[in-house]
Interface confidence: low
């Protein structure tokens, strides 16, 4: 089971929707539903994201960058990694900056893994600058 | 197949050279030249690197960190993955930031993988600093 | 052989002290010792790490974060991974940055694997935001 | 030495599109910043829009944001800037200029391309 | 946005007048202003960046100063080649110029 989903610019909600079939993305053994990875064999994952933030005018508002995970059994939302970036550039002027995540999970079927960002507007969404993906290990 | 190239401070030009012997550096099924590692075996890597960027005096000019891909059976290169830092520090200062990509890439027999930076004075090619790897899947 | 360790508010000292038990922590096939990572399988491991730092009031003091290694039957450690931050938020302000570090090492039955930081009251040890994990190839 | 060359300005009229191209030479093309700056007859500067040296990240004024669009070809050592929905006021000079750091100043200019919009 | 305010709008001198000219902004802009000299029918060339900092091949005539909101670019001994608009430029936020200042034979 693997899967590399690219940013997808017609992300227009949290969480974030993704790229399935073209250019580098690819996807087998887990079904893509909704912005979500979804699991159909148990075991354990390298699940990893990127995210490429940009923006024209420096506020340094507070960047989150997070790889969720939920299975419609249970109630709420477990927050498997997340990244948070406050006070990361200077006043005003036009920045760029990129949080990458990733790690090993244990999942189990029906396990839906999304990525949640502070900001859609500051996303540039070119497949080789956000990205979100896992494999079985 | 598996590689771990670290840094070469003997880096002339872009894409980067790499250390493939000593150290931590490790290499098998795969081939490395010429600053890029060559395919042997089609099927899904996953790729990384890290490159430590740093200066004596900040102008935040920007860095770019790119991991791409050319088979020159085909015409121009892949970007499989890139981070862009823009306004990341504060002028006139010393400075030192990383750039981590990593990702899952269906690679094909002769595919070449190279690293490319926006400026190799800005580089420290110390082992543990600056790297790239795969392995397959 | 898998391990994912994710922070422990009760890191007193360096190296880290993790949590091997509870949450989205796991551990197989290798053993967690005050700190370290055992390895009990000689082979090629893919090893990962993330740290959260955050402060109340920069001062761009030097953040340091190293996966490192100790085999006791030879003197030192070796550095992995590490990065290093300068000069990377606004003085005087909240702030909040993460490191990330990732790649392949041909490890050793007895190998102890360590996560070393700068400064321990910088980090945050929520377990999706600073962890320590490893896997076989 | 570096040389920057407008061409493509000329009188259009309302509402109509135009070209305009920078070419490059005397420098590492790709590996710097350009800018679009404009001086309506008369007046003073003002910033139209920059490109990052390799073309992925791109933003705008406000004047114009949403009708022109600025893209580069390193292959060629050239800037373009499409102007699209032309107005009266997008009538003046303007000119290509180098980014010296980070899209701050302007080091090089060119010596302008005269655009006029008038019915 | 950020408005700059040059001041005066027009300026009469003579050859070997120390010359000063004003630059405001509506908000602070740290040093972050960069002076540019423009002749007509010409570019403008770059003269001084982050406030102070002479451009290489600029005459040592010039120099720029201040910070936060008031700037001042001043030429200690004017030339006949000087004679000219001069414009500042914040790029702290965006890139904004002032309206200009032309400076003319008195």
């Known amino acids: 089971s693997v899967a590399h989903l690219t940013g997808n610019p017609r992300s227009r909600s949290i969480p974030l929707e993704w790229e399935d079939t073209y250019g580098t993305a690819l996807i087998s053994g887990v079904k893509y539903k909704k912005g979500g990875l979804v699991i159909n064999e148990a075991g354990l994952y390298f699940v990893y994201s990127k995210v490429y933030f940009r923006g024209q005018s420096c506020n340094s508002q507070p960047l989150s960058h997070k790889v969720y995970m939920r299975n419609f059994k249970y109630p709420g939302d477990l927050v498997l990694m997340e990244e948070k970036k406050l006070n990361y550039c200077t006043t005003g002027q036009i920045w760029a900056h990129s949080s990458y995540l990733g790690a090993v999970f244990n999942l189990t079927v029906a396990d839906h893994l999304y990525v949640n960002i502070s900001q859609l507007s500051l996303i540039n969404f070119e497949e080789s600058k956000t990205f979100f993906g896992l494999y079985k290990l | 197949s598996v590689a771990h190239l670290t840094g070469n401070p003997r880096s002339r030009s872009i894409p980067l050279e790499w250390e493939d012997t000593y150290g931590t550096a490790l290499i098998s099924g795969v081939k490395y030249k010429k600053g890029g590692l060559v395919i042997n075996e089609a099927g899904l890597y996953f790729v990384y690197s890290k490159v430590y960027f740093r200066g004596q005096s900040c102008n935040s000019q920007p860095l770019s960190h790119k991991v791409y891909m050319r088979n020159f059976k085909y015409p121009g290169d892949l970007v499989l993955m890139e981070e862009k830092k823009l306004n990341y520090c504060t002028t006139g200062q010393i400075w030192a930031h990383s750039s981590y990509l990593g990702a899952v890439f269906n690679l094909t027999v002769a595919d070449h993988l190279y690293v490319n930076i926006s400026q190799l004075s800005l580089i420290n090619f110390e082992e543990s600093k600056t790297f790239f790897g795969l392995y397959k899947l | 052989s898998v391990a994912h360790l994710t922070g422990n508010p009760r890191s007193r000292s360096i190296p880290l002290e993790w949590e091997d038990t509870y949450g989205t922590a796991l551990i197989s096939g290798v053993k967690y010792k005050k700190g370290g990572l055992v390895i009990n399988e000689a082979g090629l491991y893919f090893v990962y790490s993330k740290v959260y730092f955050r402060g109340q009031s920069c001062n761009s003091q030097p953040l340091s974060h190293k996966v490192y290694m100790r085999n006791f039957k030879y003197p030192g450690d070796l550095v992995l991974m590490e990065e290093k931050k300068l000069n990377y938020c606004t003085t005087g302000q909240i702030w909040a940055h993460s490191s990330y570090l990732g790649a392949v090492f041909n490890l050793t039955v007895a190998d102890h694997l360590y996560v070393n930081i700068s400064q321990l009251s910088l980090i945050n040890f929520e377990e999706s935001k600073t962890f320590f994990g490893l896997y076989k190839l | 030495q570096v040389q920057l060359v407008e061409s493509g300005g000329g009188v259009v009229q309302p509402g109509r599109s135009l070209r305009l191209s920078c070419a490059a030479s005397g420098f590492t093309f790709s590996t710097y910043g350009i800018h679009w700056v404009r001086q309506a007859p008369g007046k003073g500067l003002e910033w139209v829009a920059v490109?990052?040296?390799?073309?992925?990240?791109?933003f705008y004024a406000d004047s114009v944001k949403g009708r022109f669009t600025i893209s580069r070809d390193n292959s060629k050592n050239t800037l373009y800037l499409q102007m699209n929905s032309l107005r009266a006021e997008d009538t003046a000079v303007y000119y290509c200029?180098?980014?010296?750091?980070?899209?701050?100043?302007?080091?090089?200019w060119g010596q302008g391309t005269l655009v006029t919009v008038s019915s | 946005d950020i408005q700059m305010t040059q001041s005066p709008s027009t300026l009469s001198a003579s050859v070997g007048d120390r010359v000063t000219i004003t630059c405001r902004a509506s908000q602070s802009i740290s040093s972050w202003l960069a002076w540019y000299q423009q002749k007509p029918g010409k570019a403008p060339k770059f003269l001084i960046y982050q406030a102070s900092s002479l451009e290489s091949g600029v005459p040592s005539r010039f120099s720029g100063s201040g910070s936060g909101t008031e700037f001042t670019l001043t030429i200690s001994s004017l030339q006949p080649d000087d004679f000219a608009t001069y414009y500042c430029?914040?790029?702290?936020?965006?890139?904004?110029f002032g309206q200009g200042t032309r400076l003319e034979i008195k």
């Open positions: 490109i990052w040296y390799d073309g992925s990240d791109k």
């Open positions: 430029q914040q790029y702290n936020s965006y890139i904004t």
């Open positions: 200029a180098r980014d010296r750091d980070n899209w701050n100043y302007f080091d090089y």
